[in-house]
Each structure stands twice: as C-alpha cells, then as structure tokens.
C-alpha cells in the first residue's frame, strides 16, 4: 500500500498506524480499532473509520426536496462490524444484542430487533444529498463559479470522479451537492460517494482525516465560502423498512 | 492588474533538475486562485503540468507526477516548478498561468528552457 | 485522461470569412449547470490568450466576433467576420477533469 515513504505516514488518514514492515521494508498503514491495512492512495472506508473514532480517546425551490425515502443520520456514532473488504455488515448489533439494518453507509434502515433480525443484504446508498447553508456574504456566489470549485474540491481533495457529482444547486445561502452512484456505475478503484460524504462531513466539522493538511479552506473566486450548517440525506437503491410507528413519531 | 513572469535557467543538462519561478504582481497567490505551469514543446501542443492552490495543496499530471514538484514562497508571492531527471523531451517553453475557475485567464509570456548536454 | 480533438488541424481563409473550428472531448465536460470548455488564442511567439471561457462566456476585452457554443463532447468556435489580426493558432481546453487537456490546436492561415 502506498504511503508516504520517507516518514511513514498515511496522507489519506491520520487514524492509523504505519511502520515499514511491509513487502521489502515497504511503509505499511493500519486502521486503529479494527487493524486493518488500508490503502493510504485513496480514502478509507466510512466503516473503518468510524471504528477507528470509537476506539480513539475521547479528547481526541429549484433546490432538491429529499425524497420520503430519505435517511438522515439520527443514530449518530456506533462501533461498527465491518466486513474484510473494509465495507459495512449489513447487520449491525450492540453489546446489549439490539440489532438493526444498514446501508453501505452505515446508517440504520430498519426499527431495531433482536438478535434475530435478518439482514439480507447490504443495501446500497446510491444518492446523497449535502445540503449546506453558507454565512453570510457580501452577495450571492455566482452559480457556475460554485459548481466549479465544489466539482474541483470533489475531484482533487476526495479524489471522486466528477461524473458521481449529479449536481449543484444554489439559492443563497442553501447550497446543495448531490452525488449519485449506482452499483453498476462504480468500477474498481473508483472512490465511494459514501466515503467522499464522510470526509466532506468531517472536513466542514473542522474534523479533518487527512494526515497533516490543513483543515478545509474553500473559496470562491477568492471569496471564503464558510458553512454553518450541514444536513446529509442518503437515498439507498431500495427504500428503508420501518415500522409506521416510527415514521408517525 | 494581474501579471505573471517566469524565470530561470534557459539551458539544463539531461538527468538534471529543471527550476522555474514565476513572479505574480497584482495579486497575493495566497488570497485565492491556482497557480499553474504548463508546457509547450516547440512547434507543438499545450501540456498542463499542475498546479498549487491558494492554501497550498498541489495537483499534478499523473504523466509528469513523479518528477514534479510545484512550491511556493508566499512573503516573495512566487510559485516554483521543479522538474526531475529531465531529457531532451523536457524542452519547451514554460508558462505560467492563473487558473480563476477551471480555466487560465492570466499566464507570463513564457521562458524557453532547452534541455542538452 | 480525456482526449480532445480539433478540426480542421489547419485552415486558410479570407479577411471577412465566417470561420468555425469544432473541438470534441472524448468524454462529456459538462455539468448540469457548466461546460468546461475553454478556447484559446495563440500567435507565434506569445502565450496563449484566454477567448471563450465556459464554451460561450466571451472574456472581457475579446471582440464579440468571437463566439462558442457545444455541450457535452461537441463544441464550437466561430469567428463571424475574420480580421487580419485574428490569423493564429486555436486551442480548446477541458477543466471537467484532471489532468486539464487540450486540443491539438487549429493553424488559421490567410487564404
């Protein structure tokens, strides 16, 4: 796996653990919390990075409506099972034995069971929406000047293909960027649009992954595009299963 | 008014490291924008290089990736490009060029490096 | 990489001839809301010169006999009434991916 070689260290996440014991002295990196390696040229899967943050110290209108199938991430953090390949089990069980359903983003899909409960398979999110909600600026950005440098930020910062960004809307201050990605889209190497969300959510967090980089400064024309609010509605191939008692809730 | 001007070394011997500076006026590379090299071997086409941005972070052409290196000296508000291991297929004339949204609206007026022993 | 593909390679023609020089990318450089599609300027001797951002957007200072249109692959560059100082070579550039590619140019000569 490559990483930066001189010092040994993982540029695509600083939650791991890299030493030079790798095929002819080769730098090596594992995820903290599972010991998985990763491939520090491209991101990390959310899964693994989100057993990573589990086990790390604690101190460390022309817009789009989300759909009635649209998860929101309510449940928050969780240690998750992840599969070899780094992705979510589509089952996910706490230490209580309360169980529940997923999607590839790890966000709960089903009313939660027990131990019993079934999970298929693992559901793909194929779109998501981030809606963001700049401060305030002297005037609106210009449309196409946003489109580019979010596409840009897209494409050079998470290495994801431009053609899995859908779109960019904008109503000042709501922007919206939807990414979609179905499974027959994706090709080998091509990075997640779950993973891409991820590193977007915690990069405007001040949360970066990144080992070493400076925190997300994005600007528009020289324009400082600073976020206030974010909101992510995943939408998986196929609509969530819950009880009407929770969507009456 | 924006300007850009390259400098540097106009002859550099095969296996040698070509160096490059591009001087920006009118302008603080570090207040927003990307700042870019690209490359014209005589006669022929254009070849974009990569670029720095506004905070730091570097893009490169992957065919040029491992031999390139581009920096900046913001008190000087320069942006360099070092080119590695360079042959006789590294001779062109170098540019530098502003990069507002996607595309080059400011560039220097070139520096012809040769590359021969 | 994305490959981008000028023609005519060369063209003559007269003071006052309508010209056009068509680029095709061989993938789309377009978004829902952009066109990342540029054209460029350049005469011998001197760097580029930045005409048409966007496939249509004319930058300031460019004559407004320049134009261009296109999305997707297909795009246009049209001169309406060509001027003496408008003898040159033309490239287009695509920005939807990385690297950033160019056309191979076009060499408008005098007739």
């Known amino acids: 796996h490559t990483a930066a070689q001189d010092n040994c260290t993982c540029p695509t996440n600083k939650m791991t653990v890299c030493s030079p014991d790798g095929p002819g002295g080769r730098c090596q990196c594992r995820a903290l919390g599972s010991g998985m390696a990763v491939d520090c040229s491209t991101l990390t899967s959310k899964c693994l990075l989100l057993k990573a943050r589990m086990s790390a110290p604690k101190n460390a209108r022309t817009l789009v409506r989300p759909s009635e199938h649209a998860l929101v991430d309510n449940d928050g953090l969780y240690d998750p099972d992840c599969d070899p390949e780094g992705r979510f089990k589509a089952r996910q069980c706490n230490q209580t034995s309360v169980c529940w359903c997923v999607n590839s983003v790890g966000v709960r899909r089903t009313d939660k069971g027990d131990l019993s409960l079934r999970c298929d398979e693992l559901v793909r999110t194929h779109h998501i929406l981030i809606d963001l909600r700049h401060r305030p600026t002297a005037g609106a950005f210009n449309h196409s000047d946003l489109d580019a440098e979010l596409r840009r930020l897209f494409r050079e910062r998470y290495r994801l293909h431009p053609k899995f960004v859908a779109a960019v809307h904008y109503e000042q201050p709501t922007i919206q960027i939807e990414l979609r990605q179905n499974t027959s889209q994706k090709a080998a190497g091509d990075v997640d649009i779950g993973d891409a969300a991820y590193y977007f959510e915690r990069d405007i967090k001040g949360e970066s992954l990144f080992q070493g980089r400076g925190g997300l400064d994005l600007r528009v024309r020289g324009e400082p595009l600073q976020v206030e609010r974010t909101l992510i509605y995943y939408l998986d191939e196929i609509p969530p299963k819950f009880s009407m008692k929770r969507l009456t809730a | 008014q924006v300007q850009l001007q390259e400098s540097g070394p106009g002859l550099v011997k095969p296996s040698q490291t070509l160096s490059l500076t591009c001087t920006v006026s009118g302008y603080s590379i570090s207040s927003g924008y990307y700042w870019n090299w690209i490359r014209q071997p005589p006669g022929k086409g254009l070849e974009w290089i990569g670029y720095?941005?506004?905070?730091?972070?570097?893009l490169y052409n992957p065919s040029l990736k491992s031999r390139v290196t581009i920096s900046r000296d913001t008190s000087k508000n320069q942006f360099s490009l070092k080119l590695s291991r360079v042959t006789a297929a590294d001779t062109a004339v170098y540019y530098c060029?502003?990069?507002?949204?996607?595309?080059?609206?400011?560039w220097g007026q070139g520096t012809l490096v040769t590359v021969s022993s | 990489d994305i490959q981008m593909t000028q023609s005519p390679s060369s063209l003559s023609a007269s003071v006052g001839d309508r010209v056009t020089i068509t680029c095709r990318a061989s993938e789309s450089v377009s978004s829902s809301v952009n066109r990342f599609l540029h054209w460029y300027q350049q005469k011998p001797g001197k760097a580029p010169k930045l005409l048409i951002y966007r496939a249509s957007n004319l930058e300031s200072g460019v004559p407004s006999r320049f134009s261009g249109s296109g999305s997707g692959t297909d795009f246009t560059l049209t001169i309406r009434s060509l001027q003496p100082e408008d003898f040159a070579t033309y490239y287009c550039?695509?920005?939807?991916?990385?690297?950033?590619?160019f056309g191979q140019g076009t060499k408008l000569e005098i007739k």
């Open positions: 550039q695509q920005s939807n991916e990385d690297p950033y590619t």
């Open positions: 060029a502003r990069d507002t949204t996607a595309y080059f609206d400011y």
């Open positions: 720095i941005s506004y905070s730091g972070r570097n």
